[in-house]
Interface confidence: low
Amino acid sequence: QPPPPPPDATCHQVRSFFQRLQPGLKWVPETPVPGSDLQVCLPKGPTCCSRKMEEKYQLTARLNMEQLLQSASMELKFLIIQNAAVFQEAFEIVVRHAKNYTNAMFKNNYPSLTPQAFEFVGEFFTDVSLYILGSDINVDDMVNELFDSLFPVIYTQLMNPGLPDSALDINECLRGARRDLKVFGNFPKLIMTQVSKSLQVTRIFLQALNLGIEVINTTDHLKFSKDCGRMLTRMWYCSYCQGLMMVKPCGGYCNVVMQGCMAGVVEIDKYWREYILSLEELVNGMYRIYDMENVLLGLFSTIHDSIQYVQKNAGKLTTTIGKLCAHSQQRQYRSAYYPEDLFIDKKVLKVAHVEHEETLSSRRRELIQKLKSFISFYSALPGYICSHSPVAENDTLCWNGQELVERYSQKAARNGMKNQFNLHELKMKGPEPVVSQIIDKLKHINQLLRTMSVPKGRVLDKNLDEEGFESGDCGDDEDECIGGSGDGMMKVKNQLRFLAELAYDLDVDDVPGNNQQATPKDNEISTFHNLGNVH
């Protein structure tokens, strides 16, 4: 073991370095002192450090550690924040356009139903938005309310436009008849299934992304313990006390210290891995009736079909309702208004699905691929931080926390540390309360994600389109009745492209909380200017 180089007889170098950390030199001894009051950088001989300097080093070391951690998670944090913002906005846009298409359908095909239909459609889609954002609304109730509200208007405006004013107090009876007589066939049930499945998945997807942000934010702002601060000080700063300004910590030593400091954080690893894999499973199942974009943008068509269904059976219904709601001056004749462009244009439908494949679903898959590259983020953190802080290559001629050594030996280092600090004790303390809380939240979301994932091999609930549809209202090859008549489909395709572009039009500056985001390069610089890294 080589003897240490002669100490700086005047503490001059230490003074000039410490000046950068703490302007004012009253804490730095002029010449080396015994240092009997030191608690972290225990001297083997005269030292250029004082107790006050040691305290400042500990503070700086913990600050550096926090910066390193934030720099390590910056890319991942930005990825999730950006995507959570993109998807939330995209889902809002989908809802808005779904509302537009539905209103356009009413306006173009059933002008006599507006403006009441606009009002009911508006309320329905407002509820859809609130549900996606986490409101406690029942999807079946939303759909029932839409059809309960629509039927009286359809009856009085389309089926019986000649009803005298005195007979218009039958709305409540008509609302009841709507369900009892299944006037819309199985379309309300079909919409309930499509909307509830697609919105549940959408909602949990957004919740999961937001929890991802919370996980990163939690670990990003961890306050490191005093014990950890001492270990970091010993690794990064105690060499200066001996006048060893150019020496770097041993890589192996850095790993031991980081594993000690981050023992609690690393416990997240198992649940983080499961989170990403569960999210991937959910995303893989987000298509057709599990894809809100597909479902909501096709709703106008399904609602259109449901009104057609009423019209096909209008004669029979008018008679039955006439008796059921027993209003005196009933004039039974059907509306003469029958739009011609009411049937599904299969060519347009197929094109719409091709377009759809290039939009939000591909963006989701792309997010999962990027997230998977961070699957080992937490287990790799100690190594990442050491590789992004100054350490000696190949563990040769480096600082082991006590002295300059030619080669780092973990065993020797451990023996030398016995009186100073027990690494094992630090590991045994268990995670911080905030880390335990975030682990519990991850466990919960993982359970939800697993519950919501579409079981393998089950693509669609085929029984849905075989129950009670008359005269081929919903054919087997029509994608669960999602899709649409020629009405408005061109608009659907344009908007799907627009949604695909939305994600990529976001600048870094547009992402909340990232206005001052430094590049990794900048972050390394800001992290290490404190370390006085002149190596």
Epitope: I93, K491, N494, D510
Partner: antibody, heavy 120, light 107 residues
């Protein structure tokens, strides 16, 4: 009373910069998308830029892309247009306009406009 | 980009006349079209959106129709305050574009 008031126009040399502001009042500014539209002297209307209520979605006309930046401060009920590398053809009256909240897009409220003259 | 072509560019008419302005789109814009009126020295004012929906406060003599690529603005009985320039605007896809304008003058 629902109102939009633009300010910040003036004379500027080619290559120079200018920042336009639009103060909104009488409605919940944070709930509406906003636009900038311009009109060169004696010419028609040209849409310049749009920002969504949250500023997360932003669009520009090709003629200003890379030179103009739209932004908003919902706390201050203000919309901005930062115009850099100005050219002669940017001379126009600049209007801010509100995006309607209804089912269909349309610019339902307009400011009175502010004149920007780019000339050496 | 979607081009909008208005015709005519200039129109002379008298008070009480029925006036029709046409707006043609270079591609299908469904019903995503708005009409604006602009008096000299003033800001534009929204008249009609979604092809035919009258903006609140706009007199019922104004009406809009059409879909796809061909749209019309009709003023049934021209009033003195209606002499102005009229613009159509498509809001189907970005960039949002305006027609070149139709100036309605007193005959």
């Amino acid at each position: 009373e629902v109102q939009l008031v633009e300010s910040g126009g003036g004379l500027v040399q080619p290559g120079g910069s200018l920042r336009l502001s639009c103060a909104a009042s009488g409605f919940t500014f944070s709930g509406f998308g906003m636009n900038w539209v311009r009109q060169a002297p004696g010419k028609g209307l040209e849409w310049v830029s749009y920002t969504s209520s949250s500023s997360r979605t932003i669009y520009y006309a090709d003629s200003v892309k890379g030179r103009f930046t739209i932004s908003r401060d919902n706390a201050q009920n203000s919309l901005y247009l930062q115009m850099n590398s100005l050219r002669d053809e940017d001379t126009a009256v600049y209007y801010c306009a509100r995006d309607s909240s209804g089912w269909y897009d349309a610019f339902d409220i307009w400011g009175q406009g502010t004149m920007v003259t780019v000339s050496s | 980009d979607i081009q909008l072509t208005q015709s005519p560019s200039f129109l002379s008419a008298s008070v009480g006349d029925r006036v029709t302005i046409t707006c043609r789109a270079s591609q299908d814009i469904s019903s995503y079209l708005a009409w604006y009126q602009q008096e000299p020295g003033k800001a534009p004012k929204l008249l009609i959106y979604a092809t035919s929906t009258l903006q609140s406060g706009v007199p019922s003599r104004f009406s809009g129709s059409g879909s796809g690529t061909e749209f019309t603005l009709t003023i049934t009985s021209l009033q003195p305050e209606d002499f102005a320039t009229y613009y159509c605007q498509q809001l189907n896809s970005y960039p949002w574009t305006f027609g070149q304008g139709t100036k309605v003058e007193i005959k």
